[in-house]
Amino acid sequence: DASGDLLNTEAHSAPAQRWSMQVPAEVNAEAGDAAVLPCTFTHPHRHYDGPLTAIWRSGEPYAGPQVFRCTAAPGSELCQTALSLHGRFRLLGNPRRNDLSLRVERLALADSGRYFCRVEFTGDAHDRYESRHGVRLRVTAAAPRIVNISVLPGPAHAFRALCTAEGEPPPALAWSGPAPGNSSAALQGQGHGYQVTAELPALTRDGRYTCTAANSLGRAEASVYLFRFHGAPGTST
């Protein structure tokens, strides 16, 4: 049983004259959400103000494909993005202040894996450092969630219903309603990534129309009501 002193961790901290990179072991997030991959570093070049490049790569250190890269001009705190895979990666930290933390938007299960941060000083002090172990991103499946359900006017005074749901794996959508054989009329279109949309193209009867989203983790339901009045067509939802 060891004893330590966190109120005096200076004793355990990286000496001013060496490189070190700090990342957590793991970051957990649900598919469809965003996640922050933290990374901070120390370096031996006191008050370095020259040009720098911040890089994140996936898979393996030093050789894995880059998913993000930005460069900061001498004296600038703005790191100009040069690469952001699928536009989903953005720097949250400030490399000038030893923070390379990265935000990943719209996570998919395929984003799971290990990520490695790297900083390169490209001025007089030509130096670079990369995390060896990286941070593991665990993207977990998400139960379905209906994010939008609506009735819209269609052609020839008809109405159509739209249902958008998200989940990972992408949920299967089904419509049910007062019309006979109603659910077979649903047109399912793939949205982006973890979102799917299903359309019921012609609502022929008044009543309640229910959209059901289901995947291996669960199911979600939402309903919309159609009431047409004799004077002027309309809906109540």
Epitope: A2, G93, R97, N98
Partner: antibody, heavy 124, light 113 residues
Framework: QVQLVQSGAEVKKPGASVKVSCKAS????????MHWVRQAPGQGLEWMGW????????NYAQRFQGRVTMTRDTSISTAYMELSRLRSDDTAVYYC?????????????????WGQGTSVTVSS | DIVMTQSPDSLAVSLGERATINCKSS????????????LAWYQQKPGQPPKLLIY???TRESGVPDRFSGSGSGTDFTLTISSLQAEDVAVYYC?????????FGQGTKLEIK
Amino acid sequence: QVQLVQSGAEVKKPGASVKVSCKASGYTFTDYYMHWVRQAPGQGLEWMGWINPNSDGTNYAQRFQGRVTMTRDTSISTAYMELSRLRSDDTAVYYCARGRLLRFFDWLDVMDAWGQGTSVTVSS
Amino acid sequence: DIVMTQSPDSLAVSLGERATINCKSSRSVLYSSNNKNYLAWYQQKPGQPPKLLIYWASTRESGVPDRFSGSGSGTDFTLTISSLQAEDVAVYYCQQYYSIPYTFGQGTKLEIK
């Protein structure tokens, strides 16, 4: 010695926002993460997120995303946590707590000094 | 997210006796790169903020009496108070800092029998 002093108790209506402050002393404010943790009446501890006072980088727990904002003012060594669109189940004591030393080799992100807590009551 | 489960929920122990609190994580918090368990224990007395007791599963924080000790690895951890004192009455929490978001156990209330 390390001290974190928080602002006083607040009573808010549902839908309103609350901003809690945490003034640090006895150490270099920009050398350590600052965490926010809350505790509902008679309940356990819930991590809300952190701010890196050196870089202003933040990391929020997913359930608070879009409602919480953590900021800091390095000139007065103070961290802030603002929670918006308050609901009755946000009624809790909110703590700031000092986290990891940024220069430490390992990711030792435990909370070794805590504020006294700020009671936030949300009631109509 | 990693779920931390403590047992028992409450515990009554006589003064001078040993108190044992268990904490189980839903996944391992042992990091193979440095062979460290990313687990901490906190003590919270009524009306006070929590206080750090132990980190890395078994390293006692400075100023914490040596009757407090932590053990375990991977998913199963134990906080032991070798000889209970009156001032040890509190709620004890385990916390993992291996995986973000950080999570705490539900707490174990320790009372005197």
